[in-house]
């Protein structure tokens, strides 16, 4: 249980200002013979909380007019260092006829409630009760700066004390510190530093790589214009006032450079005509990546060595390289750029496209009837190597037989060797329509244009072949 003891009382009002690093004890005159009768602290159970005061009830009321009530003058300004303790109070003498008075503490217009250490003491006499409301802070902080007043309510009247201004002084406090920046080589830039007291003034020195930049201090706020840098530097600022100095955080000023090449490239997927790659970008050179370039060249030593370049956005580090040859080997390099320039190309990596179905049909398809053996002979030319899109494993022949009211399609598979085939006549007095497609492990290519031949009835001979011309032979 906390016991509150009465404080020694100073004679008379205490005007003016007090600068101290000790606890000022300011109170009422003790000369008039008041005896401390009752005191309580906000922590005592069953008692009113901070500043709420109940005057003991008075049974007799005198009829003579009462003087106006006012708080006694006390110290107006207390200056002290951060983390010191302070105690201040306001006092008032209240005629005993008044009941249910309350005293509350206010700071900068807001009532102080809760966890503040406020104690109210009573010194009753025959006609009046002297009330002293004390407010103490054990370790002041900057946030305790401000104007404190007491308020007392009596019969719906509000009595307000003179303000007590608390000024907490300490080392400079930064309100704006320099920020890390990425700058272009040899290009001017600004850094800002701002610090406040009290006490004021606050003076600023700038420090670059542990050396002071300005010999004479500048009043806060200060803007440092750096004409340009050729290499990374660390800047900080020192803020000085009468209490000492505070140093800001050190900030690194980086020089923008070309990026490093990617650290990783992955081949995600390959098809006959495309390769999907992803990459992990290297160091960005303190400047955001803008776009990337994928360089592709045929790995075949006999190729002409020309490089295909595909430009793409820097994100999402993924690109599908298209329009590639099937079953081909490629060397791939990746480079990315920022505002300064392009990175070196990554080490060249190898990737291959898969087999695809041929992209063109066999050429020069010729069909003729060999009546003696009752067969249809078919001849063709294989597709150009570049358009085979893989290794030919054979051909698929479609032959459709049409006569009055009958239509019948048959499919034949032919091995890759040679470029001719023979099929049996299925129906006489009918039209045979032939189409051929080349086949690789990647699939079946497109069928050639249809070639028609009429198969006459037995004994009627027509040796003229039907054909599709090779391109350019039409």
């Amino acid at each position: 249980r906390e016991e509150a003891k009465p404080y020694p009382l100073f004679p008379g009002p205490f005007p003016g200002s007090l600068q101290t690093d000790h606890t000022p004890l300011l109170s009422l005159p003790h000369a008039s013979g008041y005896q401390p009768a009752l005191m309580f602290s906000p922590t005592q159970p069953g008692r009113p909380h901070t500043g709420n005061v109940a005057i003991p009830q008075v049974t007799s009321v005198e009829s003579k007019p009462l003087p106006p009530l006012a708080f006694k003058h006390t110290v107006g300004h207390i200056i002290l260092s951060e983390h010191k303790g302070v105690k201040f109070n306001c006092s008032i003498s209240v005629p005993n006829i008044y009941q249910d008075t309350t005293i509350s503490w206010w700071k900068d217009g807001k009532e102080l409630l809760g966890a503040h250490h406020a104690i109210t003491q009573f010194y009753p006499d025959d006609e009046v009760t002297a009330i002293i409301a004390s407010f103490s802070i054990t370790s002041v902080q900057r946030s305790d700066n401000g104007s404190y007043i007491c308020k007392m309510k009596i019969n719906n009247e509000e009595i307000v004390s003179d303000p007590i201004y608390i000024e907490v002084q300490g080392l400079p406090h930064f309100t704006k510190q320099p920020e890390s920046m990425n700058v272009t080589r040899n290009t001017a830039f600004n850094l800002t530093c701002q610090a406040v007291g009290p006490p004021e003034p606050v003076n600023i020195f700038w420090v670059q790589n542990s050396s002071r930049v300005n010999e004479q201090p500048e009043k806060s706020p200060s803007v440092l214009t750096v004409p340009g840098l050729t290499e990374m530097a660390v800047f900080s600022c020192e803020a000085h006032n009468d209490k000492g100095l505070t140093v800001s955080k050190g900030v690194q000023i980086n020089i923008k450079a070309i990026p490093s090449p990617p650290t990783e490239v992955s081949i995600r997927n390959s098809t006959a005509h495309s390769i999907l790659i992803s990459w992990v970008p290297g160091f960005d050179g303190y400047s955001p990546f803008r776009n990337c370039s994928i360089q592709v060249k045929e790995a075949d030593p006999l190729s002409n060595g020309s490089v295909m370049i595909f430009n793409t956005s820097a994100l999402p580090h993924l690109y599908q390289i298209k329009q590639l040859q099937a079953l081909a080997n490629y060397s791939i390099g990746v480079s990315c750029m920022n505002e300064i320039g392009w990175s070196a190309v990554s080490p060249w990596i190898l990737a291959s496209t898969t087999e695809g179905a041929p992209s063109v049909a066999p050429l020069n398809v010729t069909v003729f009837l060999n009546e003696s053996s009752d067969n249809v002979d078919i001849r063709w030319m294989k597709p150009p190597t570049k358009q085979q899109d893989g290794e030919l494993v054979g051909y698929r022949i479609s032959h459709v037989w049409q006569s009055a009211g009958i239509s019948k399609e048959l499919l034949e598979e032919v091995g890759q060797n040679g470029s001719r085939a023979r099929i049996s006549v299925q129906v006489h007095n009918a039209t045979c329509t032939v189409r051929i497609a080349a086949v690789t492990r990647g699939g079946v290519g497109p069928f050639s244009d249809p070639v028609k031949i009429f198969i006459p009835a037995h004994g009627w001979v027509d040796y003229a072949p039907s054909s599709t011309p090779a391109p350019g032979n039409a």
């Epitope: 090449p261 990617p262 650290t263 990783e264 490239v265 992955s266 081949i267 995600r268 997927n269 390959s270 992990v280 970008p281 290297g282 160091f283 060397s331 990554s346 080490p347 060249w348 990596i349 190898l350």
Partner: antibody, heavy 128, light 111 residues
Framework: EQQLVESGGGLIQPGGSLRLSCAVS????????MSWVRQAPGKGLEWIGI???????YSASWAKGRFTISRDSSKNTMYLQMNSLRAEDTAVYFC??????????????????????WGQGTLVTVSS | DAQLTQSPSTLSASVGDRVTITCQSS????????LSWYQQKPGKPPKLLIY???DLASGVPSRFSGSGSGTEFTLTISSLQPDDFATYYC???????????FGGGTKVEIK
Amino acid sequence: EQQLVESGGGLIQPGGSLRLSCAVSGFSLSSNAMSWVRQAPGKGLEWIGIISSSGSTYSASWAKGRFTISRDSSKNTMYLQMNSLRAEDTAVYFCARVGFFVGYGAYDYGIIHRLDLWGQGTLVTVSS
Amino acid sequence: DAQLTQSPSTLSASVGDRVTITCQSSKSIYNNNWLSWYQQKPGKPPKLLIYDASDLASGVPSRFSGSGSGTEFTLTISSLQPDDFATYYCAGGYSGDSDYAFGGGTKVEIK
């Protein structure tokens, strides 16, 4: 400053397990593949395995099953879990940054281009 | 598994000598040039000297050079310096295989 620091080595009995750590500073594990390499006393270098920037791991054929590489990106640290240790696993274990790596996702393998930054190593002694 | 064979295993030389170390691979190195050379001094980790068979790593003196392609590679020190006495390793990767192979090492010692 870019730096690799291995820890976790020491004396361990045959059949025991040990976890080595490689603390990375100055760059991010999410932008570089990392590798483990070991060197038996008086012998040459032997590659153990790699963890790519995406977290895929590839190991030397002899290390598969006993040695596992992992990482904790939030701590910027790579690990080597070694189980069923044998006397012939006695070596200095190095972690190294992979300067460039190509991954073949569809075929589940990858190739190291170079190891451009190495830690000082941590000694593991397997002995009863 | 592919193997890298270095020769000689030990080399005695004097300051100022021109020194050549060879590295032979049992099959073609990836992209024919993904071969690196490392230098290691006693009690220290290896240090990258050369990559892509012939490119000098950052900060490596120009007296070091590399050449070769496919399966045959060479490291040359044009004029041996006192700081160059160390063990040198070649290393490389191969298509279709994640293994990173190291050569057996060549120790360059003072004659």
